[in-house]
């Protein structure tokens, strides 16, 4: 009787952990940053090197795919930088932006969950320019939904893993 | 039999809470902000007054020490400010930055987990200047590892507890 | 005996979830943004449309009310923007700020938990200006306490739900 109770306990303990809580922390893959100054989707991210990691979520085709319904905290940190040694900026007035979007495959549609950024005047009087954006929020995500990151001026992205990354972790079940 | 089951239950309930989940929210100790205009480590933080608090983590020698393996959400908010009543800025072009670093004592090494900030032009045309940085991310931390904060231009830090702080809370066990 | 054990288990499982963990994600209600350039409290937020949602917390009189003691992660994302088509700015030197405040009704007092922002020079040389602030932190909240958002220059707020929002989710009980 005791053994059986303990056995069913461990089952429940595992279930009460709602399987293992999903998470991801994805860092920019600098070998494949798209060019351009307009809004583009960033599709190249690391998921298994350095600080990057993923569990009970999937990374595919540049998107973070939800495998488990729940409420998740989503975040992104995006750094832009320019040094005069890399040449002059085509324009000194820049719009440096990030958009965290959710795509549902069942109902093909894409919606922006969070946005952040700034217009900047990066004048030639300074040899180095830097700017970081951080956004975060709590969202209900369903299995199969996909999270992706869009930025303006991707050619200015800082390629360091501590600079440009995004992630998610599950906080709570959907009732 | 029932009493025994209930007893072992409470043990499991406690264990399933993985002891009490660690957290910390540390606020800047303005009485001891280091000087310098280059990158310096901030070692003076409050852990037990106002909004500052700590549980199942340790604060020692300016570092937040992990006592329990796990996945943690780390965050930092750093505010810089200057008012002309305190004098002039020696340079109007500033690099206002924060670096959240992890140090492992076992393998003496320090790595930046997150960085953020901006280059700023704080011209003498304005009597007051302000800028805040926020960074956050989800990281695997092992017992004994240490989290610390480095900033540029510490003499410009806003000393308020609502302005300059960092923290961590455990979200999940390592499988 | 087995049925009884399993029954008390489900009770404990529910109790161990400490009721359902509270959360809220509130998005700006753009139909009712106050005017002015000084610090004002934002009282109009959505709690049940689009990304906005609330559970085991209450939204009343422009404040997010805590119903359950605990440690919460609080966050806010505030976007400011201006396009020349909407007219000229009265001043090009702006202080764009957010303050996340906690009010206790028992001891009528209001305290700032987090602040962020930047002084900006939004010159007439550019037709569009944008700036976002993000703050986040981990705080002990008691039932009945209220969270509210104050900003400077509310007339410059970006009214999109992905731009201007704040929220909270409970991470842990108070021991």
């Amino acid at each position: 009787e005791k053994a059986m109770v303990d056995g069913s306990w461990l089952d429940l303990a595992k279930r009460s952990k709602l399987e293992a809580q999903p998470f991801a922390h994805l860092t920019i893959n600098a070998t494949d940053i798209p060019s351009g100054s307009h809004k583009v989707s960033l599709s190249s991210w690391y998921h298994d090197r350095g600080w990057a990691k993923i569990s009970n979520m999937t990374f595919s085709n540049g998107k973070l795919i939800v495998n488990q319904d729940g409420f998740y905290y989503l975040y992104a940190n995006i750094c832009f930088r320019h040094h005069e040694t890399s040449g002059d900026l085509a324009t000194e007035y820049l719009q440096l932006m990030v958009y965290v979007t959710k795509t549902s495959i069942k109902i093909p549609s894409s919606h922006t969950l969070m946005k952040g950024g700034s217009t900047k005047y990066w004048s030639g009087n300074s040899e180095f320019h830097f700017y970081s954006i951080n956004v975060g929020g709590f969202f209900k995500l369903r299995s199969g939904e996909e999270i992706s990151i869009e930025v303006s001026n991707p050619s200015l992205l800082d390629p360091d893993q501590d600079a440009t990354y995004f992630g998610a972790f599950k906080v709570r079940d959907i009732d | 039999e029932k009493a025994m089951v209930d007893g072992s239950w409470l043990d499991l309930a406690k264990r399933s809470k993985l002891e009490a989940q660690p957290f910390a929210h540390l606020t800047i100790n303005a009485t001891d902000i280091p000087s310098g205009s280059h990158k310096v480590s901030l070692s003076s933080w409050y852990h037990d007054r106002g909004w500052a608090k700590i549980s199942n983590m340790t604060f020692s020698n300016g570092k937040l020490i992990v006592n329990q393996d796990g996945f943690y959400y780390l965050y930092a908010n750093i505010c810089f400010r200057h008012h002309e009543t305190s004098g002039d800025l020696a340079t109007e072009y500033l690099q206002l930055m924060v670096y959240v670093t992890k140090t492992s004592i076992k393998i003496p090494s320090s790595h930046t987990l997150m960085k953020g900030g901006s280059t700023k032009y704080w011209s003498g045309n304005s009597e007051f200047h302000f800028y805040s940085i926020n960074v956050g991310g989800f990281f695997k931390l092992r017992s004994g590892e240490e989290i610390s904060i480095e900033v540029s231009n510490p003499s410009l830090l806003d000393p308020d507890q609502d302005a300059t702080y960092f923290g961590a809370f455990k979200v999940r066990d390592i499988d | 005996e087995k049925a009884m054990v399993d029954g008390s288990w489900l009770d404990l499982a529910k109790r161990s979830k400490l009721e359902a963990q509270p959360f809220a994600h509130l998005t700006i209600n753009a139909t009712d943004i106050p005017s002015g350039s000084h610090k004002v409290s934002l009282s109009s937020w959505y709690h049940d449309r689009g990304w906005a949602k609330i559970s085991n917390m209450t939204f009343s009189n422009g404040k997010l009310i805590v119903n359950q003691d605990g440690f919460y992660y609080l966050y806010a994302n505030i976007c400011f923007r201006h396009h020349e088509t909407s007219g000229d700015l009265a001043t090009e030197y702006l202080q764009l700020m957010v303050y996340v405040t906690k009010t206790s009704i028992k001891i009528p007092s209001s305290h700032t938990l987090m602040k962020g922002g930047s002084t900006k020079y939004w010159s007439g040389n550019s037709e569009f200006h944008f700036y976002s602030i993000n703050v986040g932190g981990f705080f002990k909240l008691r039932s009945g306490e209220e969270i509210s958002i104050e900003v400077s220059n509310p007339s410059l707020l970006d009214p999109d739900q992905d731009a201007t929002y704040f929220g909270a989710f409970k991470v842990r009980d108070i021991d």
């Epitope: - | 310098g36 205009s37 002309e84 009543t85 305190s86 002039d88 340079t91 231009n153 003499s155 410009l156 | -």
Partner: antibody, heavy 126, light 103 residues
Framework: QVQLVQSGAEVRKPGASVKVSCKAS????????IHWVRQAPGQRLEWMGW????????KFSQKFQGRITVTRDTAASTAYMELRSLRSEDTAVYYC???????????????????WGQGTLVTVSS | EIVMTQSPSSLSASVGDRVTITCRAS??????LNWYQLKPGKAPRLLIY???SLQSGVPSRFSGSGSGAEFTLTISSLQPEDIATYYC?????FGQGTKVEIK
């Protein structure tokens, strides 16, 4: 010990220019700012401008903008103040003074002057 | 532009007297106020910085107090060598000076 030694007295005609030097010794010249302050007969002390000896950045009082140039020679640990288009009301004792804030320890020009030169009398007369 | 106003403009006191000079700022300047001593033909000397901090080498009979917009310099026991003009200063603005003489 810290010393600031200024050049000698000068007499100029209206419309002319004057250049006063200030040689520093006893400290790392590049780590501090040098201010220029003057006192006309019977008047209060009047701040004119500063130079960050490390990077050469300058700031001037609105009153002297366009007429004043402040430079430095780090190799010679010397700061210079040139005032152009002199008029009779520029007759004054001109002082250089070191800002007490060490630039290595921060980036604020603190505006408290811990060491002063002996002063240079400039007389503007036709 | 902040304006600094000192009072009195001159005073006469006996050796050993306690002497107080007041300085008012046209707006709040926190504690960013300094005091200097100026003797004819000599370089000015920093006495007090940050409203109340005594500069190294300055006799302890000199003290400063105040914050916001009102400040005082006190000489607890006037000495013959204290005959001078005293100036308050906040960043770019100086007071008009207070001339101290011996009776």
């Amino acid at each position: 010990q810290v010393q600031l030694v200024q050049s000698g007295a000068e007499v100029r005609k209206p419309g002319a220019s004057v250049k006063v030097s200030c040689k520093a010794s006893g400290y790392d010249f590049s780590n501090y700012a040098i201010h220029w302050v003057r006192q006309a007969p019977g008047q209060r002390l009047e701040w004119m401008g500063w130079i960050n000896a490390g990077n050469g950045n300058t700031k001037f009082s609105q009153k002297f903008q366009g007429r004043i140039t402040v430079t430095r020679d780090t190799a010679a640990s010397t700061a210079y103040m040139e005032l152009r288009s002199l008029r009779s009301e520029d007759t004054a004792v001109y002082y250089c003074a070191r800002d007490a804030a060490n630039m290595v320890r921060g980036i604020i020009i603190a505006y408290y002057f811990d060491y002063w030169g002996q002063g240079t009398l400039v007389t503007v007369s036709s | 532009e902040i304006v600094m106003t000192q009072s009195p403009s001159s005073l006469s006191a006996s050796v050993g007297d306690r002497v107080t000079i007041t300085c008012r700022a046209s707006q709040s300047i926190s504690r960013y106020l300094n005091w200097y001593q100026l003797k004819p033909g000599k370089a000015p000397r920093l006495l007090i910085y940050g409203a109340s901090s005594l500069q190294s080498g300055v006799p302890s009979r000199f003290s400063g107090s105040g914050s916001g917009a009102e400040f005082t310099l006190t000489i607890s026991s006037l000495q013959p060598e204290d005959i001078a003009t005293y100036y308050c200063q906040h960043t770019r603005a100086f007071g008009q000076g207070t001339k101290v003489e011996i009776k």
